[in-house]
């Protein structure tokens, strides 16, 4: 059974992940540049279901495409280089979902834009955090 300390750690990690995802979303929304149009042509795969930490496997699998899109932006809105930002997110995701899990991600039929993708995972983090508090 999860202890109060492990629950607290999970909550903090989710809050960190949430802030990183929100920072990316804000950076994109603030990005007044023709490159935004190209960024929106990238299609992201959405989880069919995202209600448990193991479903973060679906986010992990989309981190490389996310980095690729952020590289397009070359935006001053991000305090870190895309590679470092995605690396930080990857570390958190691996800790949260556990590196031992062999969960096979199941994707929804329809793909999404980067904005829809980020909003989906932001909602996921908020939902899990609310169950922990």
């Amino acid at each position: 059974a999860p202890t109060s300390s492990s629950t607290k750690k999970t909550q903090l990690q989710l809050e960190h992940l949430l802030l990183d995802l929100q920072m990316i979303l804000n950076g994109i929304n603030n990005y007044k540049n023709p490159k935004l149009t190209r960024m929106l042509t990238f299609k992201f795969y959405m989880p069919k279901k995202a209600t448990e930490l193991k479903h973060l496997q679906c986010l992990e699998e989309e981190l490389k495409p996310l980095e690729e899109v952020l590289n397009l932006a070359q935006s001053k809105n991000f305090h870190l280089r895309p590679r470092d930002l995605i690396s930080n997110i990857n570390v958190i995701v691996l800790e949260l979902k556990g590196s031992e899990t062999t969960f096979m991600c199941e994707y929804a039929d329809e793909t999404a834009t980067i904005v829809e993708f980020l909003n989906r995972w932001i909602t996921f983090c908020q939902s899990i955090i609310s169950t922990l508090t």
Partner: antibody, heavy 117, light 108 residues
Framework: EVQLLESGGGLVQPGGSLRLSCAAS????????MSWVRQAPGKGLEWVSA????????YYADSVKGRFTISRDNSKNTLYLQMNSLRAEDTAVYYC??????????WGQGTLVTVSS | EIVLTQSPGTLSLSPGERATLSCRAS???????LAWYQQKPGQAPRLLIY???SRATGIPDRFSGSGSGTDFTLTISRLEPEDFAVYYC?????????FGQGTKVEIK
């Protein structure tokens, strides 16, 4: 373990029809898009058709559009390819492949379709 | 339609040597949508590399992928006897998905 097993291939005359099946196991079939890819003797790979996990969306290569129909029965974990008005150039090994996001992660062993008079 | 051109058509090498296979796209392809497959005679293709550089499950680390835009490379650092096969690149960035014509790696 993921397994894909094609069947239904054989010899058919030009203008004839054939229905290929692909029995899937080892994964939640309804959650994944599936494709058919073919390979003519001694040639490279050619994507033929795809279908979404729900079966609601289908896609075809121009070379087979209007002649081939892809479908799936998620209750039977089976993918199908109905091939009509077959031509000599349709002669190939037909593979079914599981699509995981941007790539095909598992392939069946293939079934040979020969169109000849 | 995005055309993928692989070179060389055939690569004659000895076990232990390094193999470098090229895949050039007719227009820019997002690297997340570029994959490499290996096919041995009488067998189905097997996924080797996805996202241009990520190794698929169970693929030895002697296989590596790189590249972006229109130029992609598959490298086999030290050829093992079981590596002699045909290799295909594939893109799913444009519609329809397309494959390169293949590079055959044969024993010298």
């Amino acid at each position: 373990e993921v397994q894909l097993l094609e069947s239904g291939g054989g010899l058919v005359q030009p203008g004839g029809s054939l229905r290929l099946s692909c029995a899937a196991s080892g994964f939640t079939f309804s959650s994944y898009a599936m494709s058919w890819v073919r390979q003519a003797p001694g040639k490279g790979l050619e994507w033929v058709s795809a279908i979404s996990g729900s079966g609601g969306s289908t896609y075809y290569a121009d070379s087979v559009k209007g002649r081939f129909t892809i479908s799936r029965d998620n209750s039977k974990n089976t993918l199908y390819l109905q091939m009509n008005s077959l031509r000599a150039e349709d002669t190939a090994v037909y593979y079914c492949a599981k699509r995981h996001a941007r790539y095909f992660d598992y392939w069946g062993q293939g079934t040979l379709v020969t169109v000849s008079s | 339609e995005i055309v993928l051109t692989q070179s060389p058509g055939t690569l004659s090498l000895s076990p232990g040597e390094r193999a470098t296979l090229s895949c050039r796209a007719s227009q820019s392809v997002s690297s997340s949508y570029l994959a490499w497959y290996q096919q041995k005679p009488g067998q189905a293709p097997r996924l080797l590399i996805y996202g241009a550089s990520s190794r698929a499950t169970g693929i030895p680390d002697r296989f590596s992928g790189s590249g972006s835009g229109t130029d992609f490379t598959l490298t086999i650092s030290r050829l093992e006897p079981e590596d002699f096969a045909v290799y295909y690149c594939q893109q799913t960035w444009g519609s329809p998905p397309t494959f390169g014509q293949g590079t055959k790696v044969e024993i010298k």
